[in-house]
């Protein structure tokens, strides 16, 4: 999906109002400095691409974050403010439901959510303060 035509201001507002709090709750008891940055993004569409990938694509070390509250809210926000996003996700969601196992919060999932926080922080800063 191409995130270029999303309403970035509305997504930013949703993130600050709810998603950020859910991410921080998930990370409770863990400092963000416990993990090095291992993923970055270079503009708002790119940030949303990487956020979608980390949130919804299962990885071998962290099977699925998709049922977490922050993930549900992320999905709802993208569906609301990115034209045509929900249509592109129907098939992917159905495939994921079939293979989902019971979630256990592992250190690798904490690391992945720490990276998500970093991506969201980059997304909400409109400009670097300087060149």
């Amino acid at each position: 999906y191409d995130f270029t035509n999303c309403d970035f201001q509305k997504i930013e507002a949703d993130y600050l109002r709810t998603i950020s709090k859910d991410l921080i709750t998930y990370m409770s008891g863990t400092k963000s400095t416990d993990f090095n940055n291992t993923v970055s993004c270079s503009n708002r569409p790119h940030c949303l691409t990487e956020i979608q990938s980390l949130t919804f694509n299962p990885t071998p070390r962290c099977a699925s974050l998709a049922k977490e509250m922050f993930a549900r809210k992320t999905k709802a926000t993208l569906a609301l403010w990115c034209p045509g996003y929900s249509e592109t996700q129907i098939n992917a969601t159905q495939a994921m439901k079939k293979r989902r196992k019971r979630k256990v919060t592992t250190n690798k999932c904490l690391e992945q959510v720490s990276q998500l926080l970093g991506l969201w922080r980059r997304f909400i800063r409109t400009l670097l303060k300087k060149q």
Epitope: N37, S42, R122, Q131
Partner: antibody, heavy 122, light 108 residues
């Protein structure tokens, strides 16, 4: 663990070519800008070239423009530096380094390789 | 081309504060990054975006930047701080990375 490992250095005659590589691991390579920086023996750091996270754009120091080419393969997590028409003044340790970027601005180089030595001598 | 000027050497007594400067025209309008390099090793980022510090760098390292001078401050100097220090900026207008000439810090 995040790691950058350079290879391909060696001794080469003036006017000849050499290709350096940098293997990245422990981070999502395709999301970072990547630099080559060199250091002549006993001298300071000199920036050589940078390539965008996507590989879509490149920039070079005037001292290497037209002779060096920076490329990347995001599917293999590798960065390359093709060095042609080498001169004695290109003798240096060559480091690769990663850099987050925002729009067209490159940020600090937060992970560095250990370097590979290139000696240009007849 | 843009030039960053650093003093070739700075000395500090153990436990005292060292200040390493990086001069450039209107450098305060750029984000300045600082690197530490010990003999035979690769550079290590110690301060970025003027005054931010990577999580693995001690609080003794700090930075500031305004006008024509950026400064790296190392408080309570230790023998392990002996190294070369380089400032760096990215000049987006010319698409160039610029390093200062480096400063050798000696802890007496």
């Amino acid at each position: 663990q995040m790691q950058l490992v350079e290879s391909g250095g060696g001794v080469v005659q003036p006017g000849r070519s050499l290709r350096l590589s940098c293997a990245a691991s422990g981070f999502t390579f395709r999301t970072y800008g990547m630099h080559w920086v060199r250091q002549a023996p006993g001298k300071g750091l000199e920036w050589v070239a940078v390539i965008w996270y996507s590989g879509s754009d490149t920039h070079y120091a005037d001292s290497v423009k037209g002779r060096f080419t920076i490329t990347r393969d995001n599917s293999k997590n590798t960065l390359n530096l093709q060095m042609n028409s080498l001169r004695a003044e290109d003798t240096a340790v060559y480091y690769c380094a990663r850099s987050p970027q925002w729009e067209d601005i490159f940020e600090s180089m937060d992970v560095w390789g250990q370097g590979t030595m290139v000696t240009v001598s007849s | 081309s843009y030039v960053l000027t650093q003093p070739p050497s700075v000395s500090v007594a153990p436990g005292q504060t060292a200040r390493i400067t990086c001069g450039g025209n209107y450098i305060g309008s750029f984000s300045v990054h600082w690197y530490q390099q010990k003999p035979g090793q690769a550079p290590v980022l110690v301060v970025y975006d003027d005054s931010d510090r990577p999580s693995w760098i001690p609080e003794r390292f700090s930075g500031s930047n305004s006008g024509n001078t950026a400064t790296l401050t190392i408080s309570r100097g230790e023998a392990g701080d002996e190294a070369d220090y380089y400032c760096q900026i990215y000049v987006s207008a010319s698409r160039l990375v610029v390093f200062g000439g480096g400063t050798k810090l000696t802890v007496l």
